[in-house]
Interface confidence: medium
């Protein structure tokens, strides 16, 4: 779970260790603040749960890629 003790900066201190199906994901945001101990991705699921994930893991990259390409269809 993301931690917003030092609001408005939200940080991740632990990452999920299980892969989440892209069908369960609604959106994501990147955490790159220097105030946080590590770079992270926070996925929001279709039931509005927020999950911290490691952006260096390929399933995380693939999920972000999938979400991006749902919203950014190349021009034809």
């Amino acid at each position: 779970q993301p931690d917003a003790i030092n609001a408005p900066v939200t940080c991740c201190y632990n990452f999920t260790n299980r892969k989440i199906s892209v069908q369960r994901l609604a959106s994501y945001r990147r955490i790159t603040s220097s105030k946080c101990p590590k770079e992270a991705v926070i996925f929001k699921t279709i039931v509005a749960k927020e999950i911290c994930a490691d952006p260096k893991q390929k399933w995380v990259q693939d999920s972000m890629d999938h979400l991006d390409k749902q919203t950014q269809t190349p021009k034809t």
Epitope: K56, K58, D65, Q72, K75
Partner: antibody
């Protein structure tokens, strides 16, 4: 820290094959994609392909399809790129790189492959 | 393949100069581009990826901008260690492609 160490320089005859290795440390290769990029002398960078070491799925630039084989051994954290039917135009420095999406944040030191009769 | 056209192919500049390198994609790449620096005999080094993300340890004098098909790398005040060749790369779709490079030389 992440380190990618490649095998040494090779001199090959036209028509032969070359196999370049890339040993990773400081990362679990099954959690990432490993890519190969080459650079001919005085030229730019050219992406060749990548492997998902977890399931051995590969993706290639169509221009190399059928001539390049990318493999990985997760037990030794090593990726391999084999290029067959070598010609003089394949003379280049070959780099392995750790992929994030499709950009490359860690690179091997490069392996020079010279194709000459 | 998405072609990436980089310009200029070379430029001469002095220490302290502001340097701008441009890259044009032949279709929208939705900010999926990276910039690399390469010095002779060395592997490329990642500088910037995505919209504006500076890689860890890269000096803040490097910045990236642009959208759609047009992207720019700016070095706000050129330092002696910045003389090198710079490449853009698109990672919107495979095969991932690079620009032809820009060699930044000492004037």
């Amino acid at each position: 820290q992440v380190q990618l160490v490649q095998s040494g320089a090779e001199v090959k005859k036209p028509g032969s094959s070359v196999k370049v290795s890339c040993k990773a440390s400081g990362l679990t290769i099954s959690h990432t994609y490993m890519h190969w990029v080459r650079q001919a002398p005085g030229q730019g960078l050219e992406w060749m392909g990548r492997i998902d070491p977890d399931n051995h799925n590969t993706k290639f630039d169509p221009k190399f399809q059928g001539r390049v084989t990318i493999t990985a051994d997760t037990s030794t954290s090593t990726a391999y790129m084999e290029l067959s039917s070598l010609r003089s135009e394949d003379t280049a420095v070959y780099y392995c790189a750790r992929g994030v999406f499709g950009f490359f944040d860690h690179w091997g030191q490069g392996t020079t492959v010279t194709v000459s009769s | 393949d998405i072609q990436m056209t980089q310009s200029p192919s070379s430029l001469s500049a002095s220490v302290g100069d502001r340097v701008t390198i441009t890259c044009k994609a032949f279709e929208d790449i939705y900010n999926r581009r990276a910039w690399y620096q390469q010095k002779p005999g060395k592997a490329p080094k990642l500088l910037i990826h995505g919209a504006t993300s500076l890689e860890h340890g890269v000096p803040s004098r490097f910045s990236g901008s642009g959208s759609g098909t047009d992207y720019t790398l700016t070095i706000s005040s050129l330092q002696p260690e910045d003389f090198a060749t710079y490449y853009c790369q698109q990672f919107w779709s495979a095969p991932y492609t690079f620009g032809g490079g820009t060699k930044v030389e000492i004037k």
